[in-house]
Amino acid sequence: QIGHPSPPPEKKELRKVAHLTGKSNSRSMPLEWEDTYGIVLLSGVKYKKGGLVINETGLYFVYSKVYFRGQSCNNLPLSHKVYMRNSKYPQDLVMMEGKMMSYCTTGQMWARSSYLGAVFNLTSADHLYVNVSELSLVNFEESQTFFGLYKL
Amino acid sequence: QIGHPSPPPEKKELRKVAHLTGKSNSRSMPLEWEDTYGIVLLSGVKYKKGGLVINETGLYFVYSKVYFRGQSCNNLPLSHKVYMRNSKYPQDLVMMEGKMMSYCTTGQMWARSSYLGAVFNLTSADHLYVNVSELSLVNFEESQTFFGLYKL
Amino acid sequence: QIGHPSPPPEKKELRKVAHLTGKSNSRSMPLEWEDTYGIVLLSGVKYKKGGLVINETGLYFVYSKVYFRGQSCNNLPLSHKVYMRNSKYPQDLVMMEGKMMSYCTTGQMWARSSYLGAVFNLTSADHLYVNVSELSLVNFEESQTFFGLYKL
């Protein structure tokens, strides 16, 4: 991680934390993430089919950044959502969301990021995902597009 | 800090934390930061020549905001990076990055911010820095441009 | 919270945390917030007339997101501030701020977010608020506009 081996585990219980980075073979929603290589972290939380799976109820800070870019700006509306799904509840719950409209000059090469981050009370078995409106406009560089959380 | 004296140190070990604010005498990259006056925090982490120096291996939430503005928009590409350097490794590692292109109307006065924040596994002696593409377009007000971290 | 009951309180002291969401009956500054329903969290911190009131001195990560949108862009300057007030001190202190100018195409429907987040040393009885420049341009959906903090 970040160019050097992980530190030895601390004596106290393992910190529940994740930092996943963009994976360019995402073909549909929710976004898929790199969970193994590069500056990735995954400890005390599982990754499954695009989602972070909570295994201990508690308070978590959840964050995501998505980097949108294009070559000939058409100002298609962009949205970036972090949402939660739990088998006990019928519907996805949107936790955080960012929207952009009219953000660049028609025809120009353009680039823009959306950042979300906040504290939530999560329950064991909650699945967290990231959704975007225009997959083809997302750039998946590990430093630009990411999704993470940590237990407070 | 924030208009009143620091609280007495807590019994438990000092929290490793930093919040540095914009310093307008930055002349080159990486950006330099105010580490003494105003709403600054620096505890258990060192500040050296623009960088935050980690002295204890572990998990850290790292964040930065940069406020760009100009009198007459010409849509110069803007980038804002948080990167890491360690003497053991030959190359800088970009941890987080934001880019903007085609973000304002040509000729107009404009203003825009870039925010970055995520969790990383850092090792003692890592140096963290912030880089921007257009130094002349950065405004260094303490509430607008900052760089910080805390150990989880 | 988030569609399921809060977890039973942990044995250790209650975590000081807040996540408040947009309240559309805000009529003036500072913004008012939903502190009861939906994905709201409020524990070990009080909410009073738009403000989060600190009752224990220490280090806090404070964040806010505001979602601005309009039907017909006229590029009114937008600002989003998190500020602090304490009866011992005469003046509000701006902790974090975001500004936007020249951000959309004249006459077009537009949407944009501002995100702020950083660590501060807060003292018991500090009151934290959020201010925006153009209240009529704020959308108060709970996933889009929020204000929170947690004690490190």
């Epitope: 294009g70 000939s72 700006c73 058409n74 298609l76 009219s102 028609t106 090469m109 083809s136 | - | -």
Partner: antibody, heavy 119, light 111 residues
Framework: QVQLVQSGAEVKKPGASVKVSCKAS????????IHWVRQAPGQCLEWIGV????????SYNQKFKGRATMTVDKSTSTAYMELSSLRSEDTAVYYC????????????WGQGTLVTVSS | EIVMTQSPATLSVSPGERATLSCKAS??????????MNWYQQKPGQPPRLLIY???NLESGIPARFSGSGSGTEFTLTISSLQSEDFAVYYC?????????FGCGTKLEIK
Amino acid sequence: QVQLVQSGAEVKKPGASVKVSCKASGYTFTDYTIHWVRQAPGQCLEWIGVISTYQGDASYNQKFKGRATMTVDKSTSTAYMELSSLRSEDTAVYYCARFPDWDYAMDYWGQGTLVTVSS
Amino acid sequence: EIVMTQSPATLSVSPGERATLSCKASQSVDYDGDSYMNWYQQKPGQPPRLLIYAASNLESGIPARFSGSGSGTEFTLTISSLQSEDFAVYYCQHSRELPYTFGCGTKLEIK
């Protein structure tokens, strides 16, 4: 399949205006910008401008600003380019082309519309 | 604006031989690791057809004998073994910024 079908040839007098249409089919019209390019006989290709099919606003080559007007009709998936104050040097074949925002180039072109300006 | 200069104006090559076409930009068309240079083929009475995008990427459906190279200001289109259907006019175009500009073309004719 993707098609951009342009309106037929036009003959105009100097000082008049011409409006060329470009009807798109086989894809989601509002997902791509439409660019207009012209080619005078034996001359280079010349970029006129681009319109957002989603938002309806346009960016023009400075050379054509004030004379060219681009519009779209989302309901019929049609883009239009009107050129006013025509002169003999505007005699050219006018092309529309779509440009995917996520790509690098104009990937599909209309068949072209010959506009002849002659007194 | 960026001026595109193509050379030669006309190139005479025999079928089966290799053709190399050049395009120079008045300033760099690179940004962030990509070269915003495209190549089109045009035959009489037809619209241009995209061959190569981003300097070296082959558009789908285009034969592998076409290839592009270069970066910054100097770019090349190569046709490894000319077929009869390849004799046409070839245009380079940048998409780095507005206004987009085209070269004035290289006419590839049968020797």
